[in-house]
């Protein structure tokens, strides 16, 4: 019973975590304009992995996709890759874990096979969570570096009366969503791995029992039964469903008035 609960909870936690990783990856608020120097700005900038946006106080929001692939910073590409790998691994892990759930009966699947699949999905969740945490942390580190660099030369035109204030960026909501989601996926993976140990039948050694029949001596010795733990080469072919990613090029969250871009 405890094993089923641990497995089920691990699955649910991982599911929430992966949904969070997907949400974080799609979010536009990975970095948001630092409002320390101007808390009442009429123009607010924020950036995601796929596009950058500007929200005016008027309520109009304009988003522009990063149409170049080669022109983007290597770090941003690395973060994108880590998040996508995390999502793909998590999605496969979810697919595997559905079939591995003890409460779900699929044909005559043995506990050994379920244990094997539970461990596989658990490892996938752990790696998925680590990918998300790593991706978000790399981006956060990049932000911190850029923040202090832009602070060092905050005012680039102090020669005369005219000031050119550089826009500084700080942590956006997506970073926190990503960290929490990565952590949940990681915890879910660990729970799946723990559940796997309970699912695997223990190795049982039956002691030899001698049966003495009257008349003639016959010793019946049943062989020691060895349960397959399923950690060997009990692998099955799995289909990977990779949904095509769609990106919105431009977004106008305002009653349309002009085509201006």
């Amino acid at each position: 019973m405890a094993v089923t609960a641990c497995q089920g909870l691990g699955f649910v936690v991982s599911l929430i975590g992966i949904a969070g990783i997907i949400a974080a990856t799609c979010m536009d608020q990975w970095s948001t304009q630092d409002l320390y120097n101007n808390p009442v700005t009429a123009v607010f900038n924020y950036q995601g992995l796929w596009r950058s946006c500007v929200r005016e106080s008027s309520g109009f929001t304009e988003c522009r996709g990063y149409f170049t692939l080669l022109g983007l910073p290597a770090m941003l590409q690395a973060v994108r890759a880590l998040m996508i790998v995390g999502i793909v691994l998590g999605a496969i892990g979810l697919l595997v874990s559905i079939f591995a759930l003890k409460c779900i009966r699929i044909g005559s699947m043995e506990d050994s096979a379920k244990a094997n699949m539970t461990l596989t999905s658990g490892i996938m969740f752990i790696v998925s969570g680590l990918c998300a945490i790593a991706g978000v942390s790399v981006f956060a580190n990049m932000l911190v570096t850029n923040f202090w660099m832009s602070t060092a030369n905050m005012y680039t035109g102090m020669g005369g009366m005219v000031q050119t204030v550089q826009t500084r960026y700080t942590f956006g909501a997506a970073l926190f969503v990503g960290w929490v989601a990565g952590g949940l996926t990681l915890i879910g993976g660990v729970m799946m791995c723990i559940a796997c140990r309970g699912l695997a039948p223990e190795e049982t050694n039956y002691k030899a029992v001698s049966y003495h029949a009257s008349g003639h001596s016959v010793a019946y010795k049943p062989g020691g039964f060895k349960a397959s733990t399923g950690f060997g080469s009990n692998t099955k072919n799995k289909k990977i469903y990779d949904g095509g990613a769609r990106t919105e090029d431009e977004v106008q969250s305002y009653p349309s008035k002009h085509d201006y871009v």
Epitope: Q33, N38, V40, T41, A42, V43, N45, Y46, Q47, S52, C53, V54, E56, S57, S58, G59, F60, E62, R64, G157, V162, Q163, T164, V165, Q166, T167, Y254, P255, K257, H258, Y260
Partner: antibody, heavy 118, light 113 residues
């Protein structure tokens, strides 16, 4: 057709109060940020206050902060400016304006004159 | 606060003439996020409220004649009327649309010679 009509102006004594109204029509009022802007021959155009579509955030010019209160009634399509502790320098033509692309004011009312004098 | 300085205060022109008025801000109005300049131009005729002409420094509002052109970036901006018409005689204001408080220039008055 977008229309903004201000009302409530008039002669007020220094230290007195006045409430200006701006009736909006011809557009979805609840979807736009609104402003009060005043004009005097001496100072020209001076931004007074801003209220976003959902009534938060609200910003004021330093010259009126603590004395003026901007508010709106979305179901009634009306914008308000409650003015207290009025001074002679508050004498001006008060316009309400709609906020649009580029943080510009694309529609203005005809204005209502507020005169602060003893 | 961002200070907007308009020059000249008065411009005396003849009909059909090309005219340029300038506006300078004490701080850059260029937003790095979308590379747009948050400067607006208005026209005000006597007894009327201001009318929006140009936003984002160079985008003409719908219905505004194409003889009106906004230009400039950062801190220096200009409004050009390619061929002044009698109905263009008015006060022209520039406005900082980048940060609160939203500030206006003192205006440039266009007069007939």
């Amino acid at each position: 057709d977008v229309q903004l009509v201000e009302s409530g102006g008039g002669l007020v004594q220094p230290g007195g109060s006045r409430k200006l109204s701006c009736a909006a029509s011809g557009f979805t009022f609840s979807g736009f940020g609104m402003h009060w802007i005043r004009q005097t021959p001496e100072k020209g155009l001076e931004w007074v206050a801003y209220i976003s579509s959902g009534s938060r955030p609200i910003y004021y010019a330093d010259t009126v902060k603590g004395r003026f209160t901007i508010s709106r009634d979305n179901p009634k399509n009306t914008l308000f400016l409650q003015m207290t502790s009025l001074r002679s320098e508050d004498t001006a033509m008060y316009f309400c304006a709609r906020f649009y692309y580029g943080n510009s004011f694309d529609h203005w009312g005809q204005g209502t004159l507020v005169t602060v004098s003893a | 606060d961002i200070v907007m300085t308009q020059s000249p205060s008065f411009l005396t022109v003849t009909a059909g003439e090309k005219v340029t008025m300038s506006c300078r801000s004490s701080q850059s109005l260029l937003n790095s996020g979308n590379q747009r300049n948050y400067l607006t131009w208005y026209q005000q005729k006597p007894g009327q409220p201001p009318k929006l002409l140009i936003y984002w420094a160079s985008t003409r509002e719908s219905g505004v004649p194409d003889r009106f052109t906004g230009s400039g970036s950062g801190t220096d901006f200009a409004l050009t009327i390619s061929s002044v018409q009698a109905e263009d005689l008015a006060l022209y204001y520039c406005q900082n649309a980048y940060s609160f408080p939203l500030t206006f220039g003192a205006g440039t008055k266009l007069e007939l010679k």
